[in-house]
């Protein structure tokens, strides 16, 4: 809190300009009018104020706008944004994508801070859904943004926004998130032809059900092992050896290196050993010949 002191003679600020740069904290408090600051916020970023000085400027804006800053001020906060707390930001009503971009630009190089998370939350809630332009902007600044959302939040993403998603944006998504995103991606890319469709859908396949994997196996897609290893175990288990062979194409040889890891390990345990032998990869652990396989889950369903 800055003490209230009278402004020295001749130091009253008539505009926000570089003459303020060496004002002490108390001089800024006493000599800069908050309303003037609010109307000339765009000038603040052109002046290398120290963080101590920025604290004073923030204090003045807080006094002027106790209910939260108007968007005209927010848009020009510049690196004063770094001084805002999540509590400050919760009072804002940010509707312009340009304002969001301006503030994300200031935060570039930082991890996603609680301030930024709050800002994005306020913005998205205000819009009602995560539209394509917003998603484009957010993933450009924070590739991991999508995977920071809960499955419930992801459900508000319209399929049209999926076009903005890049493979690296999904790197940290867990299966629950991909379960939500995959059907949206399938819908978004449904009019593409086989090979183009696979390129686009590939990074979402961690949410794909068995029947979609079976369908892909008929299309010569040559899925790489990294993608295969991210598939849902429950979706991979029902696939036959022939289907996995078709799905992976030349990459099928990679199964050997992954035979101890899920989902490959669990899939091997479900296959007949003589079927696995047809691959010629030396995969071991399948069901020995002559054994009968009872699908207990099917039995339970019938009873």
């Amino acid at each position: 809190e800055v003490e209230k002191t009278a402004c020295p003679s001749g130091k009253k600020a008539r505009e926000i300009d570089e003459s303020l740069i060496f004002y002490k904290k108390w001089e800024l408090e006493a000599c800069v009018d908050a309303a003037l600051l609010a109307t000339q916020m765009d000038r603040v970023n052109a002046i290398p104020f120290t963080y101590e000085q920025l604290d004073v400027l923030k204090h003045k804006l807080d006094e002027l706008y106790p209910q939260g800053y108007p968007e005209s001020v927010i848009q020009h906060l510049g690196y004063l944004f770094l001084k805002m707390s999540p509590e400050d930001i919760r009072k804002w009503n940010v509707t312009s994508l340009e304002t969001l971009k301006a503030l994300l630009e200031v935060n570039k190089g930082h991890e996603m801070s609680p301030q930024v998370a709050t800002l994005i939350d306020r913005f998205v809630k205000g819009r009602g859904q995560l539209d394509k332009d917003t998603l484009d902007t957010l993933t450009a600044f924070y590739p991991g943004y999508l995977c920071s959302l809960s499955p419930e939040e992801l459900s508000s993403v319209p399929p049209s926004s999926i076009w903005a998603v890049r493979p690296q944006d999904l790197d940290t998504c867990d299966p629950r998130q991909l379960d939500v995103l995959y059907p949206k991606a399938r819908l978004a890319f449904q009019n593409m032809n086989g090979s183009e469709y696979f390129v686009k859908i590939q990074s979402f396949l961690g949410g794909a059900p068995t029947e979609d994997l079976k369908a892909l196996s008929q299309q010569n897609v040559s899925m790489d092992l990294a993608t295969f290893m991210k598939l849902r175990t429950d979706a991979v288990l029902p696939l036959t050896v022939a289907e996995v062979q078709k799905l992976l194409g030349p990459h099928v040889e990679g199964l050997k290196a992954e035979e101890r890891h899920r989902p490959v390990r669990d899939w091997i345990l479900r296959q007949r050993q003589d079927d696995l032998d047809t691959l010629g990869l030396g995969l071991q652990g399948g069901i020995p010949n002559g054994y009968l396989v009872l699908d207990l889950s099917m039995q339970e369903a019938l009873s």
């Epitope: 570089e18 740069i21 002046i47 290398p48 963080y51 101590e52 000085q53 604290d55 690196y79």
Partner: antibody
Framework: QVQLVESGGGLVKPGGSLRLSCAAS????????MSWIRQAPGKGLEWVSY????????YYADSVKGRFTISRDNAKNSLYLQMNSLRAEDTAVYYC???????????WGQGTLVTVSS | IQLTQSPSSLSASVGDRVTITCRAS??????LAWYQQKPGKAPKLLIY???SLESGVPSRFSGSGSGTDFTLTISSLQPEDFATYYC?????????FGGGTKVEIK
């Protein structure tokens, strides 16, 4: 890309004068605050002088106040440091540096050596 | 505001994790930058706002801290990292630098 090139350094006797120049390119010079920072041989960095983008606001370290004058010519993309009444303790490499929106030094020149010795 | 760096010099090997500290004489929020200077060269900005990596700086460099105590960490020292490192505060004028930490080859 951003380039800052200092010149004007050299050997001068105590009490003498020198004028350092810094030619800037690759950025909008007139938008940036500029600084002179010096480094005595084997020592750390000392912020010597600062000039605002228009040239109307200036700072000097106490150690050079009254002896050094910073100026700029935005039309020529140039920064200057006029050094008078030089002392042995002014011996240093002098760097010009641009200030980003934060008061820190984003881009530096390669430096010019000033030696004050009789 | 005075900045005190420690140690003033250290010896380390390629691959080592190196930590340099900078202590401010009073609280400076997160208004701290780190620079690297190689012999005969100008300093180069590495980190600002205590922890933000300047564009183009390798991710093995990281900064942390707030208030009075700050740290620069090099997670796995590379041959090109042998240099002198300086901290600088920009919480209040006049802007000041730490005395430097020289990182030498063991």
């Amino acid at each position: 890309q951003v380039q800052l090139v200092e010149s004007g350094g050299g050997l001068v006797k105590p009490g003498g004068s020198l004028r350092l120049s810094c030619a800037a390119s690759g950025f909008t010079f007139s938008d940036y605050y500029m600084s002179w920072i010096r480094q005595a041989p084997g020592k750390g960095l000392e912020w010597v002088s600062y000039i605002s983008s228009s040239g109307s606001t200036i700072y000097y370290a106490d150690s050079v106040k009254g002896r050094f004058t910073i100026s700029r010519d935005n039309a020529k993309n140039s920064l200057y440091l006029q050094m008078n009444s030089l002392r042995a303790e002014d011996t240093a490499v002098y760097y010009c540096a641009s200030t980003s929106p934060r008061p820190l030094f984003q881009h530096w020149g390669q430096g010019t050596l000033v030696t004050v010795s009789s | 505001i005075q900045l005190t760096q420690s140690p003033s010099s250290l010896s380390a090997s390629v691959g080592d994790r190196v930590t340099i500290t900078c202590r401010a004489s009073q609280g400076i929020s997160s208004a701290l930058a780190w620079y690297q200077q190689k012999p005969g060269k100008a300093p180069k900005l590495l980190i600002y706002d205590a922890s933000s990596l300047e564009s183009g700086v390798p991710s093995r460099f990281s900064g942390s801290g707030s208030g009075t105590d700050f740290t620069l960490t090099i997670s796995s020292l590379q041959p090109e990292d042998f240099a002198t490192y300086y901290c600088q505060q920009f919480n209040s004028y006049p802007l000041t630098f730490g005395g430097g930490t020289k990182v030498e080859i063991k």
